[in-house]
Interface confidence: medium
């Protein structure tokens, strides 16, 4: 039951987490204008990753994409890359999570195969919620950089035009989103490592025991054999002697290693 | 105050010829210039652009018939405009733009030239 619970909520936690990433990454405000010194500025700007917009204070909005003559900046493009990466994975884990929860029956399908699923999710959760993390994050610190940056040309008079022309921006709401969802996202998919493990078949190993046969000194040992009687979860006794057949901590020990650039 | 700054727009028949200079004014060192246009009740439109290293990106409206051209130096970019249609009408803008550090180029745009296309 417990299992049941755990891979439910993490399935919901990451569920809310992915929709999180997903709006994070559509919403214009990942970046928005300081309005230090300047509070009664009658416009002001905000910038997403697809589009910068203008709000008037009539309340008049217009947004229109990037003009640039250039192509975008290589760190722009890293960030809109880890997002969609981010959204892919999770979505693709969704997918995945779906028919691996132990609530929903699909065929004749395993707890072993549900356990393999279970973790499969899991992990791309995790890596899904580190790219929104790290999306978000490389974001915040090209933003932190140039604040400081356009301060340090505000108040020393370097720089020449870049002090008058420059705009500061601070962090926008989708960032605050971002890094929630991409938490969350990586919380659930924690959850579903965890409920893999309560899935993983408990196959259990019965001790040695000597059985004496009346009027013989024969001793029947049929240690290391695997339970098979209908006891524990295994109760359709299939593939419980193949040699595929793996203890709960050999489903843990698969190495994952996941390269970020 | 940066500020671009626009010249030879008018009136000119079609098949004619005009060309339209831009001068930026203050220390601005802008890594790429280009024209745009807007014609009335039309989104504003890349004409010609030329960046730093000297790539240019014309429209397919207007290839083979204009020609983009910067002085560095003088801190201004011209459009050559030949063989003008009456399709060719529109304000046309004058646009810098400028990498600061942050993700975005800082934009500067002119107040606009009128080019029309009439006999």
């Known amino acids: 039951m417990a299992v049941t619970a755990c891979q439910g909520l993490g399935f919901v936690v990451s569920l809310i987490g992915i929709a999180g990433i997903i709006a994070a990454t559509c919403m214009d405000q990942w970046s928005t204008q300081d309005l230090y010194n300047n509070p009664v500025t009658a416009v002001f700007n905000y910038q997403g990753l697809w589009r910068s917009c203008v709000r008037e204070s009539s309340g008049f909005t217009e947004c229109r994409g990037y003009f640039t003559l250039l192509g975008l900046p290589a760190m722009l493009q890293a960030v809109r890359a880890l997002m969609i990466v981010g959204i892919v994975l999770g979505a693709i884990g969704l997918l995945v999570s779906i028919f691996a929860l132990k609530c929903i029956r699909i065929g004749s399908m395993e707890d072993s195969a549900k356990a393999n699923m279970t973790l499969t999710s899991g992990i791309m959760f995790i890596v899904s919620g580190l790219c929104a993390i790290a999306g978000v994050s490389v974001f915040a610190n090209m933003l932190v950089t140039n604040f400081w940056m356009s301060t340090a040309n505000m108040y020393t008079g370097m720089g020449g035009m870049v002090q008058t022309v420059q705009t500061r921006y601070t962090f926008g709401a989708a960032l605050f989103v971002g890094w929630v969802a991409g938490g969350l996202t990586l919380i659930g998919g924690v959850m579903m490592c965890i409920a893999c493990r309560g899935l993983a078949p408990e196959e259990t190993n019965y001790k040695a025991v000597s059985y004496h046969a009346s009027g013989h000194s024969v001793a029947y040992k049929p240690g290391g054999f695997k339970a098979s009687t209908g006891f524990g979860s295994n109760t359709k006794n299939k593939k419980i002697y193949d040699g595929g057949a793996r203890t709960e901590d050999e489903v843990q020990s698969y190495p994952s290693k996941h390269d970020y650039v | 105050q940066v500020q671009l700054v626009e010249s030879g727009g008018g009136l000119v028949q079609p098949g004619g010829s005009l060309r339209l200079s831009c001068a930026a004014s203050?220390?601005?060192?802008?890594?790429?210039m280009a024209w745009y246009r807007q014609a009335p009740g039309k989104q504003r439109e890349l004409v010609a652009g030329?960046?730093?290293?000297?790539?240019?990106n014309y429209a397919d409206s207007v290839k083979g018939r204009f020609t983009i051209s910067r002085d560095f130096a003088k801190n201004t970019v011209d459009l050559q405009m030949n063989s003008l249609k009456p399709e060719d009408t529109a304000v046309y803008y004058c646009n810098a733009e400028i990498y600061t550090g942050t993700f975005y180029p800082r934009s500067y745009w002119g107040q606009g030239t009128l080019v029309t296309v009439s006999s």
């Open positions: 030329m960046t730093r290293g000297g790539s240019t």
């Open positions: 203050g220390e601005i060192s802008s890594d790429a």
